[in-house]
Each structure stands twice: as C-alpha cells, then as structure tokens.
C-alpha cells in the first residue's frame, strides 16, 4: 500500500489592514509546533479589497458587507475548511479612521460596528476590529521587518536570507508611508528618548529593545498632497493653480469642498472666491520640493533635535527598511536599487517631473491616470520627507532599503500585529526542545 501523506500540522491567521485609501487582507501560515520560533510565519495570500478605505463608507455603512465579500470568500478558499473555526481574524484600521474619529467618535464607531458585524458572519474566529494607534502601527511594522529578517534569532547564520541583510543582530529601522500617515521607528544608539510618547520598551526572545517611534498624522502621501494644495491655493490669484508637482500639460479640476473635507487641511482653510479650481501642471521638481518643505515646520523644537512640527527625533542609526508607499512609489519610478545614490534619485525625479503629461500617459498606458498623475508629487514628497523631514543625508541614503516583500511576506504592520495578538513572539528565548513527533514522520 502507498504511504499516505500525513495532514500538515499548520495554523492560519488573517489580518485586514484597513488603510485610508484601501483595505488589504493578508493570510499567514505557520507550523503549529514551531509557534515560538522566529521567522516561521509567512504570508500565503494578499487580497486587495476593491474600493476605497472604510472611512469613506461613513454615509453608506450598509455597503460595507458587500465591499468585504470577495476577499473574505478568497480566505474561505485558501484556508482549509477544517481550519476555519480556529483561524483568528483581526482588522486594524489606521490613519484614515483616526481622522474620521477626530471628526466624530460615533461615526468611526458606526463604521467599525458594521465591519465587525460583517466579519462575524464568516466561519472564522473573528477577534475584533479596532483603530490601532500610530505608535502601534510603527511598532508592529518594526517587529514585522525584523522578524522576517531574522534579527530576533539568536543563531548567527553564515548565509544571508535577503540581499541587503547584514549578517548581524542589529535591528533595522522601519519607515512606513501610508496615504494619511507616515511612521518612523528605530533603535537609537545610546540615546535617551527625550519624549516619553515616542519611547517603546520591548523584551523579545530574551533581549531588551528601547525603540523610538513616531507617527505623523496627515503626512501620508495623499493627505500631504491635500495639505499642499490647500496651502498653495491660498496665494493663487485666481481659480488656476499652476502646480510644479504635476507634469506639464496636466489639468485637473478640484472642488474646494473636497479640499477641506479632511482635518488635515484645517490650518490652511479660508474662504475662496470660487467653488472649484484647476490644477495646471508645470512639472518642476525644485519648485515642487520647495512647496512641500513649507508643510514641515522646522522653526520650533523643544528637544535636542527634531524631525519637524516640534517632534523629537534622535540621530538616525543603522539600516532602515522603507516599505508600503515608500516602496510602491519608488518601485514605479525604478529607484529601489541599492546602487542608486540620493543624487541620482534627485536627478531622475527632476527628469520625470519635467516630462510632458501626454508623453507620460503614452509611456505608462496601463496605469490609471489618477495614480499616474501623482507619482511626480509622491516621489518628490518621499525625498523631501526623508531628507528634510527625517534628516537622512546623501551619505546615509545608502542605509535606506526600499522593501516590498521579505521572504515572500509583505513588509508592513500586519504581520507584527498578528504575531503580538497570537502571542507568537515570546519575551524570553524559547528553550531548544527535542525533535517533535512530526519531525520523525
């Protein structure tokens, strides 16, 4: 008789990342008997929910159930039926929902309530939907990349898992860019974290980590663009905004009511003598960069040093993984290579922004115009944020690694969130155990 393959003893977990611009569902898988080992959890599926972020459903909450259906059904297919009931499902909402909650706690709560009711209808072990803090978002992103890079493992390896991995136990810093917020998280070198709000203490696998983190609400790429437009339209002489952050020949009509539909533009709000204005691109990197810098208040710092807006930032230390929109934007611009210097990135951005819109549309015919039109701004914003906001230099630029995936798992906060909630990162180093039964099979 033929040997029957024993069913693999694996577990699954689902995390939904409810971001400001969209929601993504991630499915993770790991060997059941190795839960406390580092690096054993990996992503088996990502499903991007069609439509906007959940905060946009505030006036139509009854549509949330349908919105989540396709990806939840995909999870049903991917995860074996026998595992459904024991597969935890977590939903974490980020800055889009933080902004909605600033406007009204009830509105945010109503959206989450419908999300919870929708997710409870599936056969999985639903564990709740909540708005995670910016601090958590930064911390879990840092845990994710260092877990995947094997930085928490006490075993030193003679080989490298990933091209940019230095073979030591120094953790990587985490740079996360979303649509509505951006996070910076790293272990400073022997530096006191001067503001308690930015300090995190972890004990992971028997080692203590003093981590700095900050989340800048309203400084994700989409909200930063709204801020820039609101700032610039204040000084426009008429309803035409000649904008250096868009390609020459690009035109778009913006409703003033949409411009002020976010708490992020409140500081620039004023009565304009028109209901709409037209963006006319002029495609000038340098001017775009200058305009973006005006969003960062660097004139005030109550600490030894600051990022911007009076927020403490210790001196940068070590290597950094830059992921989410940092990666997506730079990947589109073909600027993720380790060999590309900061000067070269700036040079290429100057050329890209100066390209006529008609030429750009032809060159990237398969890309949606809404996204395509914003890469000049987004690329320039990334440079401005990293260089002037976080004080990276031409020299330290080489310590930034633009990361999409590590070992097949997306870099981002979701894996760290699940590892924490399923207690899969022990405080102490697990004792090496004898071979489990499954190893003998």
């Amino acid at each position: 008789t033929q040997n029957k393959a024993l069913p693999e003893n694996v577990k699954y977990g689902i995390v939904l990342d409810a971001g400001s611009s969209h929601t993504s569902l991630y499915i993770y898988k790991w060997p059941a008997e190795k839960e406390n080992d580092t690096g054993v959890v990996h992503q088996v599926e990502e499903c991007r929910v069609k439509g906007p972020g959940i905060s946009k459903f505030v006036q139509k909450v009854n549509e949330i159930g349908i919105y989540l259906t396709d990806c939840m059904e995909r999870a049903r297919e991917v995860i074996p039926r026998s595992q459904h009931q024991e597969t935890p499902v977590y939903l974490g909402a980020t800055a889009g929902m933080r902004l909605l909650r600033m406007e009204s706690e009830e509105l945010a709560d109503r959206v989450l309530d419908v999300v919870e009711r929708s997710l409870s209808n599936y056969p999985f072990d639903f564990q709740g939907a909540r708005i995670i803090t910016g601090q958590e978002e930064g911390a879990y992103g840092w845990i994710t990349i260092n877990y995947l890079l094997g930085k928490f493992s006490q075993k030193t390896r003679w080989f490298s898992i990933v091209p940019y991995e230095t073979n030591n136990q120094e953790t990587f810093g985490a740079l996360d860019l979303g649509g509505a917020s951006t996070q910076v998280t790293f272990v400073p070198q022997n530096q006191t974290i001067e503001s308690p709000d930015n300090a995190l203490q972890f004990r992971l696998y028997g080692k203590d980590y003093n981590v700095y983190t900050h989340s800048f609400l309203c400084y994700g790429k989409d909200q930063a663009l709204w801020q820039k437009l609101a700032k610039d339209i204040q000084v426009a002489s008429n309803e035409i905004l000649r904008d250096p952050c868009f390609h020459p020949g690009y035109k778009k009509v913006v409703n003033v009511s949409d411009l002020y539909k976010t708490p992020c533009t409140k500081r620039f709000e004023m009565t304009l003598p028109f209901q709409q204005f037209e963006i006319q691109g002029i495609g000038n990197y340098q001017q775009c960069h200058q305009s973006i810098l005006e969003l960062f208040n660097t004139s005030y710092c109550p600490y030894s040093q600051c990022a911007f807006n009076g927020i403490f930032l210790p001196p940068l230390q070590g290597d950094f993984g830059a992921f989410s929109a940092f990666y997506f934007v730079m990947k589109f611009l073909n600027l993720t290579s380790e060999k590309v210097s900061q000067e070269k990135v700036t040079e290429m951005m100057k050329k890209f922004c100066a390209q006529p819109w008609e030429e750009i549309k032809t060159s990237y015919a398969g890309v949606k115009e809404k996204y395509l039109s914003e890469y000049c701004f987004s690329g320039t914003y990334i440079l401005s944020l990293l260089l002037q906001g976080y004080h990276f230099t031409a020299d330290s630029w080489e310590h930034i690694h633009f990361i999409g995936k590590i070992q097949g798992s997306d870099a981002g906060w979701t894996l760290g969130y699940m590892l924490n909630l399923t207690n899969m990162i022990p405080a102490e180093q697990p004792l090496s155990t004898p071979l489990s039964h499954s190893t003998y099979v």
């Epitope: 505030v58 706690e105 002020y260 708490p263």
Partner: antibody, heavy 123, light 106 residues
Framework: EVQLVESGGGLVQPGRSLRLSCAAS????????MNWVRQAPGKGLEWVSS????????SYADTVKGRFTISRDNAKNSLYLQMNSLRAEDTALYYC????????????????WGQGTMVTVSS | ETVMTQSPATLSVSPGERATLSCRAS??????MHWYQQKPGQAPRLLIY???NLASGIPARFSGSGSGTEFTLTISSLQSEDFAVYYC????????FGQGTKLELK
Amino acid sequence: EVQLVESGGGLVQPGRSLRLSCAASGFTFNNYGMNWVRQAPGKGLEWVSSFSSSSTYISYADTVKGRFTISRDNAKNSLYLQMNSLRAEDTALYYCARHGRYGGYGGFYFDYWGQGTMVTVSS
Amino acid sequence: ETVMTQSPATLSVSPGERATLSCRASEGVKSYMHWYQQKPGQAPRLLIYKASNLASGIPARFSGSGSGTEFTLTISSLQSEDFAVYYCQQSWNDPTFGQGTKLELK
C-alpha cells in the same frame, strides 16, 4: 466665551422658503460639527440636521429630508439652514447647537446652544 | 430611527430628595447617551455626555449611568433650581431625543 446667535426666522406662508443663519464666536469654528435642533411650541426637542467639522458627514431628519439644506461658511464662522417647501408642522423655535468633543474626538451631542429663532408657517 | 422613551413623564420630588430619571432606547446605543436640562424660555443645557461624564460647570449632584438600552440620570439632592424639563438624547444613530421628563416641586 462661546456664543451662537440665530437669525432669519419669521412668519412665512406654506410652500415658501426661509434661510436661517447662525453666527458663532468664541471658539475655532472649523474644528466643530454644527447642528440645527427645533422645538415646536409646548413640545419636545427634535434634531433637524448636522454638518460635521470637515463636512465628511451631512445628515437630515426624515421629516425635512429633500426640503432643507444645511451649509456652513468657516471663514465667516457661520452656519445656515435653507428651508424650502415649508409646512405648518415646521413651525418651531430653531436652535443652532455645537457638537461636543470626547477629548480629542468629535461627539454628536450638543454642548452649546443659541437662544433660537422662531419660524412660523401659516397662511 | 432609534426611539427614546423617558419615564416618568412627570416626577414630583421635594427639595433635598433624590430624583431618578430613566431613559430607554429602542435599540442598543452603546454609551452614546446624553442628558439636557431645559427651563421655561431658555435653551437646553448639557448636563451629562456619553452616559456618565459631567459637562463643564455642572454641579456634582448630577450623575448619569447605564449603557446599551437603559440609562439613568440621578440628582442626589434636589435644589430649587433643578426643577425643569430633562431630555435624554442618543447619538449612536442620527440624533433622537426622548419626549422629556418634567421634574416638579412636590
């Protein structure tokens, strides 16, 4: 000191229109949601319409939906209620009320009220 | 819509006594329940927000409790200025008020 002052009320015939205004002072107007609440003579309070701080959420009571329009001008620190196709049952004292806050978050309760403006719909 | 039912419609109490006013929601409203006081010829005044939080400038003899569908406003020791009409309001759905409880001098 927070102040809300309503104006624009008066006697109007059924089917006609009226525009109410609320002038706000003593707080950063664009940081707060604003509302209209009405009270018919000798009756209880009835919420009419809300306009959240960033205009993400604009809502109306079923009794006025399609007839009334709420708007705000943050630069003028003003809230408005355009009332069309008025009916006898719209007769009430109309209050302008500010949304409260739960710490850093907005709340759909009413922490400050104006003294109201009377609207009488009668032929 | 969420219907709010206040009881009793009228409550007669002597000064110095305790007054307990009830409000029931037709569906769960979490802790999004608020209480107002209104005196004749005046605008309503916020007393309690989010079920149990005392509004600014309101005396500590006022307190609120409850969650879900059942809520209570308690005035521990009635003062002469407390005789008025009291309204509850939910904000879990679009705002709705109770019909009011008239607190009168016994």
